[in-house]
């Protein structure tokens, strides 16, 4: 028997993916476990194999269909269970009735690119991935820029309160290497959280022109 405190947290990406993390103090490392999704009003059900991400936590992604297909709505309730093998039987380790649109976490923004760079400013664009058409343009973004000698945690957060998939960074230092990240969040959902940060985009500002005061 496995004892200890258990936490089972899942998020819906608003389209066709439910990502889950299960943590269990004192869990057995060699036990095979999976997450099983059973919707209350759909004809499909889905399973994914939990894989270790740390000493006492496991994660998996329930793929519900094609990436941009709308597989769930606000009225769906999905029973999610953690099942672990005990000999020839499966034991239920955790269970929750999951309301997908109350537990949203979108995919990280993708396709970050420098549109234009100067000595003191840089225009960057990105795209959102697998976000439901229900949101239309009603999303918010946070962005941060990593300056030399600083950490990501020290970087001030820039907030964009609308679906604006670009930003113009200003007051930058000439001939300096920077990195940039962005994340996205819908307005809907009591337990909704920010997406993961995007992959960092590295860029360098242009050097100041020689003999000119910039």
């Amino acid at each position: 028997a496995v004892n200890g405190t258990s936490q089972f947290t899942c998020f819906y990406n608003s389209r066709a993916n439910i990502s889950c993390v299960w943590s269990q103090d004192g869990a057995l490392q060699d036990t095979s476990c999976q997450v099983h999704a059973w919707p209350d009003r759909r004809r499909w059900n889905q399973t994914c194999e939990l894989l270790p991400v740390s000493q006492a936590s496991w994660a998996c992604n329930l793929i519900l269909g094609a990436p941009d297909s709308q597989k769930l709505t606000t009225v769906d309730i999905v029973t999610l269970r953690v099942l672990c093998r005990e000999g020839v039987r499966w034991r239920v380790m955790a269970i929750q009735d999951f309301k997908p649109f109350e537990n949203l976490r979108l995919m990280a923004p993708i396709s970050l690119q420098v549109v234009h760079v100067e000595t003191h400013r840089c225009n960057i664009s990105w795209e959102i991935s697998q976000a439901s058409h229900y949101f239309e343009r009603h999303l918010e973004f946070e962005a941060r820029t990593l300056s030399p000698g600083h950490t990501w945690e020290e970087a001030p957060l820039l907030t964009l309160k609308q679906k604006q998939e670009w930003i113009c960074l200003e007051t930058l230092t000439p001939d300096t290497q920077y990195e940039f990240q962005v994340r996205v969040k819908p307005l809907q959902g009591e337990f909704t959280t920010w997406s993961p940060w995007s992959q960092p985009l590295a860029f360098r500002t242009k050097p100041a022109a020689l003999g000119k005061d910039t």
């Epitope: 009003r41 709505t73 606000t74 009225v75 649109f101 229900y134 343009r137 009603h138 307005l187």
Partner: nanobody, 119 residues
Framework: QVQLVESGGGLVQTGGSLRLSCVVS????????MGWYRQVPGKQRELVAD???????KYGDSVKGRFTILRDSVKNTVYLQMSSLNPEDTGVYYC?????????????WGQGTQVTVSS
């Protein structure tokens, strides 16, 4: 301003049929679910049937096999085809729509239409 307008209610004999309609109109919205609920005096409003995006219909136990819900997402209209009606089906039938407006989801209700089944 969003409006839900029901029609098609009335008086019918036991064993008869009725077809209810509900149309959603108003400012810009996206509907992800539409359905029907009913209320009889002294009781809670109960689900009759609803249909979510992806075509998943859900029916109340007492109407399964007798009632059929149809949804036209283009016209923002939901229909309830009721057959083999009995006096227990008497009540006020309310249309409900789950609508996305400016990035948030809310439920909207119609005023209701009376269905009376006489024995």
């Amino acid at each position: 301003q969003v409006q839900l307008v029901e029609s098609g209610g009335g008086l019918v004999q036991t064993g008869g049929s009725l077809r209810l309609s509900c149309v959603v109109s108003g400012s810009h919205f996206i509907s992800d679910v539409m359905g029907w609920y009913r209320q009889v005096p002294g009781k809670q409003r109960e689900l009759v049937a609803d249909m979510a995006d992806g075509g998943s219909a859900k029916y109340g136990d007492s109407v399964k096999g007798r009632f059929t819900i149809l949804r036209d997402s283009v016209k923002n209209t939901v229909y309830l085809q009721m057959s083999s009606l009995n006096p227990e089906d008497t009540g006020v039938y309310y249309c409900k729509a789950g609508l996305w407006i400016t990035g948030r989801h809310s439920d909207y209700w119609g005023q209701g239409t009376q269905v009376t089944v006489s024995s």
